[in-house]
């Protein structure tokens, strides 16, 4: 026999006290698939949390983060507070990144600065607390004689033949 | 071990102020996030108001929303809970509880540690 149950759609729950007839699900609740007995209650956002999505008859609420945070965990079940960009959070708080690291975020750890001569190339841009370095040409590119880059030709005047 | 222990419940008039206290041991207080939740006779556990490790930002139950101040001494190893023109339906236990990650509000399921609650009665 099949389970008049599995009838019921999402949004709907099997109501054992009538009959098993498929029942909406009260305010404030919630079923994502067919064949509930019972409906979820809805996540409310309340306090760090704001709502980003309102709760459905078949869908939960989803919360993010007031600004100032961001979230952490499975659907943002956490609210971690934001550092500048710049810094890091540690165990002793927002910390500034250490010389040689950087960290373009509000959130995260700082990383170390790329190595241009890994690369074989030279920095062109220093980096920051803030900024990775910007890597440029590569320092045999830059010995006289070898410019990689051609010149632009010299414009020439009006009435001038090429010689 | 961790411990937080509430006082400054008491019986109070309609109207009337009252401020609790939560002393805290056993972890680095300055490093965590610190709630206030309350229990109505026969209700369920309700979210009243949330403060962040450093105490520059708060958060609030709608319904205390105006009336209540949460605040901490992080110097002190205390949380407060000033409460004013208390209601009727402000009366419950009141626990302190802690947030389980350093510098994170998390939502109440995931608190780590509770107090044993402050009864607080607004009545006539």
């Known amino acids: 026999l099949q389970d008049p149950c599995s009838n019921c759609p999402a949004g709907t729950f099997c109501d054992n006290n009538r009959n098993q007839i498929c029942s909406p699900c009260p305010p404030n609740s919630f079923s994502s698939a067919g064949g509930q007995r019972t409906c979820d209650i809805c996540r409310q956002c309340k306090g760090v949390f704001r709502t980003r999505k309102e709760c459905s008859s078949t869908s939960n609420a989803e919360c993010d983060c007031t600004p100032g945070f961001h979230c952490l965990g499975a659907g943002c079940s956490m609210c971690e507070q934001d550092c500048k960009q710049g810094q890091e959070l540690t165990k002793k708080g927002c910390k500034d990144c250490c010389f040689g690291t950087f960290n373009d975020q509000k959130r995260g750890i700082c990383r170390p600065w790329t190595n241009c001569s890994l690369d074989g190339k030279s920095v062109l841009v220093n980096g920051t607390k803030e900024r990775d370095v910007v890597c440029g040409p590569s320092p045999a590119d830059l010995s006289p004689g070898a410019s990689s880059v051609t010149p632009p030709a010299p414009a020439r005047e009006p009435g001038h033949s090429p010689q | 071990q961790v411990q937080l222990v509430e006082s400054g419940g008491g019986l109070v008039q309609p109207g009337g102020s009252l401020r609790l206290s939560c002393s805290a041991s056993?972890?680095?207080?300055?490093?965590?996030?610190m709630s206030w939740v309350r229990q109505a006779p026969g209700k369920g556990l309700e979210w009243v108001s949330d403060?962040?490790?450093?105490?520059?930002?708060?958060f609030y139950e709608d319904s205390v929303k105006g009336r209540f101040t949460i605040s901490r001494d992080n110097a002190k190893n205390t949380l407060y809970l000033q409460m004013n023109s208390l209601r009727a339906e402000d009366t419950a236990v009141y626990y302190c509880?802690?947030?389980?990650?350093?510098?994170?509000?998390?939502?109440?399921?995931?608190?780590?540690?509770w107090g044993q609650g402050t009864l607080v009665t607004v009545s006539l």
């Open positions: 403060i962040n490790s450093g105490g520059e930002s708060t």
């Open positions: 056993g972890f680095t207080f300055s490093s965590y996030a």
């Open positions: 509880a802690k947030h389980p990650l350093t510098y994170t509000i998390a939502t109440m399921n995931d608190y780590d540690y």
